[in-house]
């Protein structure tokens, strides 16, 4: 960076090298060049020479003033015009940064994704700070009073093996950067209450020929949790609003859910689950696309329909009486 150059003097920033975005700042340059009484002192920002708001303080020092500085990062350097020197002489350089102190972290959430072996804690960091901001996650056992701290730049994965202080913990997040420090409210957790079941996945769909054709969605999860509640949402891809069906589920076998849908329409399905009565849901599964047949086929036929809409690949095989979709795309 600019800070590694050999200096013939020095450059400094008031109020500081890292300052609040939108502040008025002054950059000072002081020359210390042998056999040179500088005629002029020049400032450069990101390689562009500054024209305005330069004031000479004394024989060796000048000040560059910026009003309402809004750039997150800038490389500054200054030069001197020395008599009898054809080129400007480099004095010194400095990288400067502007940003904001961190907001109070809120919406602190800790979950254990089944089989992950980790407790994942996330939070809303608030507005962008633009400068290096670190987060310390504090985890304190309510049983042993022992506290552990984890340093991170965003979220944190804490091995469940390291949570030796029983089941109940307090979790809070401290945010800090050069401009300030803030601390979240404390979140009380019980390890048994924050487990999210293994992801539910829709594997295929088929539309069955009947007086009123029905579509069956096949879906499954590898969870070992016995009591699981799930939601499946679906809509025509052209619609904005979702329809939601709720299920109490036992994943000892593949789930089959029936839907009575309009013909010749492309639908999207997603599923999510939670341990019954607990707080946290899985994220919605990847979209699964299925197009209902125009009319129910009366004769045996084979066809393949390739559909790459929205990165999803639908392969449909038609045979007498039903249509099957197998969509493993994203």
């Amino acid at each position: 960076g600019i800070t590694n150059i050999n200096c013939s003097g020095h450059i400094w920033v008031e109020p500081a090298t890292i300052f609040k975005m939108g502040m008025n700042i002054s950059i000072y340059c002081q020359a210390a060049i042998k056999n040179c009484q500088p005629r002029k002192l020049h400032f450069y920002k990101n390689g562009i020479k500054e024209r305005f708001q330069i004031t000479r303080i004394n024989k060796t020092t000048a000040r560059l003033w910026y009003k309402n500085f809004l750039e997150p990062h800038a490389s500054m350097y200054c030069t001197a015009e020395c008599p009898k020197h054809f080129q400007e002489t480099l004095i010194c350089g400095k990288d400067i940064s502007s940003g904001y102190p961190p907001d109070i972290p809120d919406e602190v959430t800790c979950v254990i994704y089944e089989y992950s072996g980790n407790m994942t804690c996330t939070w809303n960091a608030g507005k962008l700070t633009y400068i290096d901001t670190k987060y310390v996650v504090h985890v304190k056992s309510l049983e042993t009073e022992e506290e552990q701290q984890y340093l991170t730049s965003s979220y944190i994965n804490i091995s469940t093996d390291s949570l030796q202080g029983g089941k109940k913990y307090l979790v809070w997040v401290q945010a800090a950067n050069a401009l300030g420090m803030e601390e979240s409210k404390q979140l009380q957790i019980h390890l048994d209450d924050i487990v999210i079941p293994s992801a539910a996945v829709i594997s295929r769909a088929e539309t069955i020929n009947a007086t009123v054709p029905k579509t069956i969605i096949y879906w499954d999860s590898q969870t070992t949790i016995e009591k699981v509640s799930c939601e499946m949402r679906y809509k025509a891809t052209t619609n904005q609003t979702w329809n939601v069906k709720e299920f109490d589920t036992n994943f000892t076998y593949v789930q089959q859910s029936e839907f009575y849908l309009e013909p010749n329409i492309k639908y999207v399905f997603q599923v999510r689950c939670q341990e019954t009565g607990k707080r946290y849901w899985q994220p919605w599964s990847s979209p699964f696309f299925h197009k209902t047949p125009e009319t129910v086929p009366q004769v045996t036929s084979k066809a393949f329909q390739h559909d790459t809409w929205n990165s999803g690949l639908t392969v449909a095989s038609i045979s007498t009486g039903h249509l099957t979709s197998d969509n493993r795309g994203d």
Epitope: Q37, P38, R39, K40, I48, K49, E50, R51, F52, I54, T55, R56, K59, E81, P83
Partner: antibody, heavy 119, light 107 residues
Framework: QVQLVESGGGVVQPGRSLRLSCAAS????????MSWVRQAPGKGLDLVAD??????????YYADSVKDRFTISRDNSKNTLYLQMNSLRAEDTAVYYC??????????WGQGTLVTVSS | DIQMTQSPSSLSASVGDRVTITCRAS??????LAWYQQKPGKAPKLLIY???SLQDGVPSRFSGSGSGTDYTLTISSLQPEDFATYYC?????????FGQGTKVEIK
Amino acid sequence: QVQLVESGGGVVQPGRSLRLSCAASGFDFNSYGMSWVRQAPGKGLDLVADISSKSYNYATYYADSVKDRFTISRDNSKNTLYLQMNSLRAEDTAVYYCAVHHSDYFEYWGQGTLVTVSS
Amino acid sequence: DIQMTQSPSSLSASVGDRVTITCRASQDIYTNLAWYQQKPGKAPKLLIYHASSLQDGVPSRFSGSGSGTDYTLTISSLQPEDFATYYCLQDSEYPPTFGQGTKVEIK
């Protein structure tokens, strides 16, 4: 050798517009700052507008008396400097000189073009 | 902006005279001063820059000196072609500013 030739002056009514041009030759136009300096009849020299060189990213400056009325610009491909003068006033009557500077003192000057603002 | 005060505003002199014109800045300008000559109906012409450096092609009878806030243009032996108006210009801080001019007339 350096040559600066202004054009576009003339008599104009108050409130009207005029565009001055300055054709430059004999130097690396991109590397020099260009200015318009005016001289009212029987008066001294005043910097009206300035457009810096490439090293300053062509920063522009205007005297308070012409801010929001005059616009300085340059076409580096044509080695030409312009001054767009809008909402002209009687006090804008002057000889307008195009001048070139490498540092901030004016090294070379054009012959000037007279702008008369009168009803 | 830096203010430049020139004196005298006019002077009468004869051919062969030594003429001195002074320019005072409202603050230290660190020898960032230029002198110009302007004849009626003509553009200004650069004589001196950096307070004491003679521009190419300018006769050696012209010289400049000074530091800090006070600067001087000297014509060692006034010639007929030197009757003109002289301006100083500071370019230490932006924007550059001119003195109000000194008119050198024939006595």
